[in-house]
Structure formats: C-alpha cells, structure tokens
C-alpha cells in the first residue's frame, strides 16, 4: 500500500502586513481515518492554528468548501496578517483514536511578513 503523503508545496510564503496568507496542503489519500490540524512551530510547544472540531479561529478559514465530499485539500487562509504571525506552519494528519495519534506532518511552510507598503 502506498504511504499517505501530506504535501505542502511551498517552502515559504511572504505576505504584506494586513493582507491574507494562503497556506496550501493536500493529502494523497482519504485514509487512514482521522483529522487534519494546522500548527505553527514544531514540538511540544507548537501552537494550534486550525482544527475544525475544537476551538475558535476567527481569522482562519478553509480555502475549499468544508462541505465538499471526499476532498483532499486542507489549505487554509489566514486573514489580517501581522508580524506576530511569522513562523513555520505545519499541516498534520492524525489517525483517529482516543486520543488521536499524529501520523504524518507536511514539510512546513515558512510565513514571513513584510511591512505594509506606505
């Protein structure tokens, strides 16, 4: 069986402050069963950026229609970017469980924030 791939095609993205940033992520298969989550940073101190099930993420929206069937695009858009948003963002696939188990992470996309043009 082919191993699941989590694909973040851009190594880096540069966005002007105040604009929106699109962070792309696709997976190669619908299975194993389990959710996708986005994080900033790696390791135990990483920050949860988007998880549809839990939390409130007013600045983050999925790029593709969340009701689309059998969709493998888990890209997100972050609005009103500020310098504090800079960092490396990871799209992470989890295997369903109690609790869910991290299965595979994308390679990461580094977000840099440019000063807003005057």
């Amino acid at each position: 069986e082919e191993e699941l791939q989590v694909i973040q095609p851009e190594k880096s993205v540069s966005v002007a402050a105040g604009d929106s940033a699109t962070l792309n992520c696709t997976v190669s298969s619908l299975i194993p069963v389990g959710p996708i989550q986005w994080f900033r940073g790696a390791g135990p101190g990483r920050e949860l950026i988007y998880n549809l099930k839990e939390g409130h993420f007013p600045r983050v929206t999925p790029v593709s229609d969340p009701t689309k069937r059998n969709n493998m695009d888990f890209s997100i858009r972050i609005s009103n970017i500020t310098p504090a948003d800079a960092g490396t963002y990871y799209c992470v696939k989890f295997r369903k469980g109690s609790p869910d188990v991290e299965l595979k992470s994308g390679a990461g996309t580094e977000l840099s924030v440019r000063a807003k043009p005057s």
């Epitope: 069986e1 699941l4 298969s29 619908l30 299975i31 194993p32 069963v33 389990g34 959710p35 996708i36 549809l52 099930k53 999925p62 593709s64 229609d65 969340p66 009701t67 689309k68 069937r69 059998n70 969709n71 493998m72 695009d73 888990f74 295997r95 369903k96």
Partner: antibody
Framework: EVQLLESGGGVVQPGGSLRLSCAAS????????MTWVRQAPGKGLEWVST??????YYADSVKGRFTISRDNSKNTLYLQMNSLRAEDTAVYYC???????????????WGQGTLVTVSS | EIVLTQSPATLSVSPGERATLSCRAS??????LAWYQQKPGQAPRLLIY???IRETGIPARFSGSGSGTEFTLTISSLQSEDFAVYYC??????????FGGGTKVEIK
C-alpha cells in the same frame, strides 16, 4: 455504478463463528474507509466496525469478538465474527464511507445486507 | 457516546402533506449529521449529509436543517414512495458512530 454485495450470512449456534464478505465494485475501493452496520429484526441501525487502511474501529458490543479486514487486491471487505451470541442476530450491511473534509464519515452506498441468525 | 433521539417515533401523514421529523443530539455535533431513508426489506439510502446537503439524485422535496443539537428533516409534499423509516446519524464524535432510533412515516 457503485455496488456492494454481502455474502456469508446464515444460521450459527451460540459460541460459533461466521465470516462475512462484501464484494465492492464501481469505485476505487482502496481509497475509501469501509464500514459494517447491523440491524436486528424490527430494530434500528447499529454501527459495528469501520476500517481505513489498517486502522480499525469497533463498537464496544463486538470488540474482542469481531475482526474487520479488507483485501484491496480483491476489492473485498470482511467481518470475522467469533463467539457469536443471540443478540448478534441481525442483517449485516456493508457500507462505503464518504467524508466531508475536516470532518467525519457517513455512508453513501450500502449493500443489500446478509442475515446472520444465532440460535441453538 | 452521543445519543440521538428522534421524534416522533411514528408520524401519520396524508399524501401531499408536509412531514417534519426531528433529531436531537445529546451534545453539540455542529453540522455533522446525516439522514437516511429505509424502506421495508431494503438497505438504507443516504438522503442528506452535513445537516442540509442533499445527496445527488434526492428530490428537492427533502430538506435538512439545524445545527448543534437540534436537527430537522422536512419532506415538503409526501409522495407514496416516501413512506418509510428515517434515521439520523452523527459523525462528529466517534467511535461509535450513532444512529437515532428512527421515525416511521406512515400513511394517514
């Protein structure tokens, strides 16, 4: 056209075993999770088990007794049922999972079911 | 485990009338709810998913609404082929996937 065809049902004594099969066609079988749902006579629907790609999930009522598996080369889903009890008597349906991105699974295609009767 | 309670258990409706079926979840399932129709001797058939989206090929007289813990399946004008048992199913928090106990829509 998606088709799911269950087989392997029948009458078995309490404590006995049975293996159900579900032959799938009309879609890329290996790309989707698959599920077994059962329905006792005159009763409602009860989820039994789901398999992704090696990841398996079971209802508490069958855990340790039933084993779900799949053979992607044969486009076939299986349910091995051991230590059968009278309360396992039901029509067993196999179903293809469909998912809404970011979310969970529901069942968009169902087979016609196979009847399992556990009786002495 | 999330418990789904369907009401009424039986709904007697005349052909051409509107039928309103309820499904209540014991906790918030957001929009992660599906509706199925089952006729005697047949397998269930998917009608609605994501609480409100009609499956391909399902007539427009079927509509789903609600979110959180309260959901409704409405059949705007009952046809003879709509007399059946209807089940809701949540897929927000599993295992286990859970189904409601069903609502039987019968001819008045």
């Amino acid at each position: 056209e998606v088709q799911l065809l269950e087989s392997g049902g029948g009458v078995v004594q309490p404590g006995g075993s049975l293996r159900l099969s579900c032959a799938a066609s009309g879609f890329s079988f290996s790309n989707f999770a698959m599920t077994w749902v059962r329905q006792a006579p005159g009763k409602g629907l009860e989820w039994v088990s789901t398999i992704g790609s090696g990841d398996t999930y079971y209802a508490d009522s069958v855990k340790g007794r039933f084993t779900i598996s799949r053979d992607n080369s044969k486009n076939t889903l299986y349910l091995q049922m051991n230590s059968l009890r009278a309360e396992d008597t039901a029509v067993y349906y196999c179903a293809k999972d469909s998912t809404v991105s970011w979310s969970g699974d529901f069942f968009d295609y169902w087979g016609q079911g196979t009847l399992v009767t556990v009786s002495s | 485990e999330i418990v789904l309670t369907q009401s009424p258990a039986t709904l007697s409706v005349s052909p051409g009338e509107r039928a309103t079926l309820s499904c209540r979840a014991s906790q918030n399932v957001k929009n992660d709810l599906a509706w199925y129709q089952q006729k005697p001797g047949q397998a269930p058939r998917l009608l609605i998913y994501a609480a409100r989206i009609r499956e391909t090929g399902i007539p427009a007289r079927f509509s789903g609404s609600g979110s959180g813990t309260e959901f409704t399946l409405t059949i705007s004008s009952l046809q003879s082929e709509d007399f059946a048992v209807y089940y809701c199913q949540q897929y927000y928090d599993w295992p286990p996937f859970t189904f409601g106990g069903g609502t039987k829509v019968e001819i008045k």
